[in-house]
Amino acid sequence: MMCLECASAAAGGAEEEEADAERRRRRRGAQPGAGGSACCGARGVGGAGVVSADEEVQTLSGSVRRVPSGLPSIPSTPGCAAAAKGPSAPQPKPASLGRGRGAAAAILSLGNVLNYLDRYTVAGVLLDIQQHFGVKDRGAGLLQSVFICSFMVAAPIFGYLGDRFNRKVILSCGIFFWSAVTFSSSFIPQQYFWLLVLSRGLVGIGEASYSTIAPTIIGDLFTKNTRTLMLSVFYFAIPLGSGLGYITGSSVKQAAGDWHWALRVSPVLGMITGTLILILVPATKRGHADQLGGQLKARTSWLRDMKALIRNRSYVFSSLATSAVSFATGALGMWIPLYLHRAQVVQKTAETCNSPPCGAKDSLIFGAITCFTGFLGVVTGAGATRWCRLRTQRADPLVCAVGMLGSAIFICLIFVAAKTSIVGAYICIFVGETLLFSNWAITADILMYVVIPTRRATAVALQSFTSHLLGDAGSPYLIGFISDLIRQSTKDSPLWEFLSLGYALMLCPFVVVLGGMFFLATALFFLSDRAKAEQQVNQLVMPPASVKV
């Protein structure tokens, strides 16, 4: 399922602190004294930015003032800073901060590249792993299921942690964890297949931490179109990492003469990236809610977060739409190469495959198309959204809806074209996937608009969970089941092998249309939910005593 798996897991989250800068500007000097001691004594969830010699530095989570040696520096809200310096004190903003944010976003994007590189390195040497451990197809299915299930289960946990604790530490620990597990898994003896299964589960947990939390930090670093751009860069990581994973897997295997070495590349890079995240990514806070200190955290429980998210119609519908994308990408990634191979058998341009891997050439072409359309889709989606925002405030969900509905048409055409022209089928795949992937970054943006900063990691996690549960965790199996069901009631022939799989895959465009409908539903509620989120944020920046969550 090249380049596709868990795209939706990441897409959805990069939002949290993006609105902060704006709210900070709005709030600057507004409450010089309100709740001064409570607010200035608030505990920071992470370290603050770098403090230059004499002055206060405006960090992404507030401002930090250089304190005389011997006294601890206190991360404070802009209000507190203003109180300390006097109501009219200017707030210097070093030029390095912009570069720092760019570097942080670049490192986070690099981490995402590695996340997918690691995942698809395993995919790239999967045949070797199967061969070495004697893994049957059901065993390979188990490896996939364990990964997805552990990812699904871990995501909400990291969502909870990501909204409450130091995110860059969680991120780094996640990267260190999956790096160590992947590296160790390259030494698993042949007889311990269950250890390989366990390692994939543990890697799923480690990667869930990243996919859930990293986008929310990017959300805190940027606003508006810059955020969309940075999210696009972040989501480029999916096709790039996946493609590089395949390349790394096969090339390292060939160079070293042993597939085990392929599993030792990404962990080394992972350790480096994890360290860079600790050093270069600022310990951003979650909007002004964080700046109100521990008070809000004490008031908002995970259950309350979940209730709020479930009541958020834009979030619910966009999550269901994301599940539809995940369903289609999971099923198409698994079955399209085999379907195209069967099409060629029917067209008499290929032999019936008796010794796997069947459709290896088609897998390669499909993988290349998927990677390229991943890039193209993200660029197209982001560009179209920026253009449409000038014309309508509902641009984000509408662009996604149009992309989904357009994609459904081209996915349908794959099955028409495949009967006569493989090239035609590939063209339809190209256009269909580009449109399908155009919503990756936008879905993340939607989530950021409609979810308040302190709930975003939980929101990403829940979206990740549902998109896997309703999407790619089951779709490949469902398509295979339907195909087998059709074949049982037909005569055994290459034609019916082709047709039965085609009919089963026709479920995908229907689900994609359904996803489009969900995005249209999101468009209906988008403005009101965004307004509600902004209103809640405004409430959160009032003095602590009056906070109501």
């Epitope: 070495h132 893994v135 049957k136 059901r138 065993g139 042949q190 007889q191 297949f193 010794s355």
Partner: antibody, heavy 125, light 107 residues
Framework: EVQLVETGGGLVQPGSSLKLSCATS????????MSWVRQAPGKGLEWVAL??????????NYAESVKGRFTISRDDSKRRVYLQMFTLRDQDTATYYC????????????????WGHGVMVTVSS | DIVLTQSPATLSVTPGESVSLSCRAS??????IHWYQQKSNGSPRLLIK???QSISGIPSRFSGSGSGTDFTLRINRVESEDFSVYYC?????????FGSGTRLEIK
């Protein structure tokens, strides 16, 4: 009790063909990978071919010395595994053993846990 | 292909003695080595799997050890029925290969 019984051996001329058959009982044949191993007179053991189960798409693997000349196949309904040998050479003269690999449902081993008694194939002019 | 070298080719012992048979791989193969016993005019039978794991029905006097490239089959207090040919086999990668065998004979 696991049983593997090979048949179809005999004396043949170089260049000719022969098909060996192995009848099995006492284990779940459809889930089990099967191999042929041969032993030339007075020599050591040599693995010839392996055929996997349906859940591994009946993938077949061969030793380099027989690739393109031998074909391994199986019939799950009859619980039989076959070795079709074409273009036989003098050096193919050996006792051919039918063997099974231990199965663990999700994966299989590559070692041979059960062996047949063997069938003699003599290639000579 | 992975080449397995067994030594010695022939080992003469008296019953009751303990012996060690060696198998060396041409490259590291972790613990993917298995040992078989073949009595004269008989079929081979599996003795030890994955270098050291015992097989049910095989006497406890047979034990294996080793990892990487060097492996050993140890027979504690050899009995008369143990005089046979012993083969090691690797399953680290295809093609599956056997060692040339070690013949255990009565001194």
């Amino acid at each position: 009790e696991v049983q593997l019984v090979e048949t179809g051996g005999g004396l043949v001329q170089p260049g000719s063909s022969l098909k060996l058959s192995c009848a099995t009982s006492g284990f779940t044949f459809s889930d089990t990978w099967m191999s042929w191993v041969r032993q030339a007179p007075g020599k050591g053991l040599e693995w010839v071919a392996l055929i996997k189960d349906k859940n591994s798409n009946y993938e077949a693997n061969y030793a380099e010395s027989v690739k393109g000349r031998f074909t391994i196949s199986r019939d799950d309904s009859k619980r039989r595994v076959y070795l079709q040998m074409f273009t036989l050479r003098d050096q193919d003269t050996a006792t051919y053993y039918c063997t099974s690999h231990e199965d663990f449902y999700y994966y299989s081993s590559y070692y041979f846990d059960y062996w047949g008694h063997g069938v003699m194939v003599t290639v000579s002019s | 292909d992975i080449v397995l070298t067994q030594s010695p080719a022939t080992l003469s012992v008296t019953p009751g003695e303990s012996v060690s048979l060696s198998c060396r791989a041409s490259q590291g193969i972790s613990t993917s080595i298995h040992w078989y016993q073949q009595k004269s005019n008989g079929s081979p039978r599996l003795l030890i799997k994955y270098a050291s794991q015992s097989i049910s029905g095989i006497p406890s006097r047979f034990s294996g050890s080793g990892s990487g490239t060097d492996f050993t089959l140890r027979i504690n207090r050899v009995e008369s029925e143990d005089f046979s040919v012993y083969y090691c086999q690797q399953t680290y990668s295809l093609p599956l290969t056997f060692g040339s065998g070690t013949r255990l004979e009565i001194k």
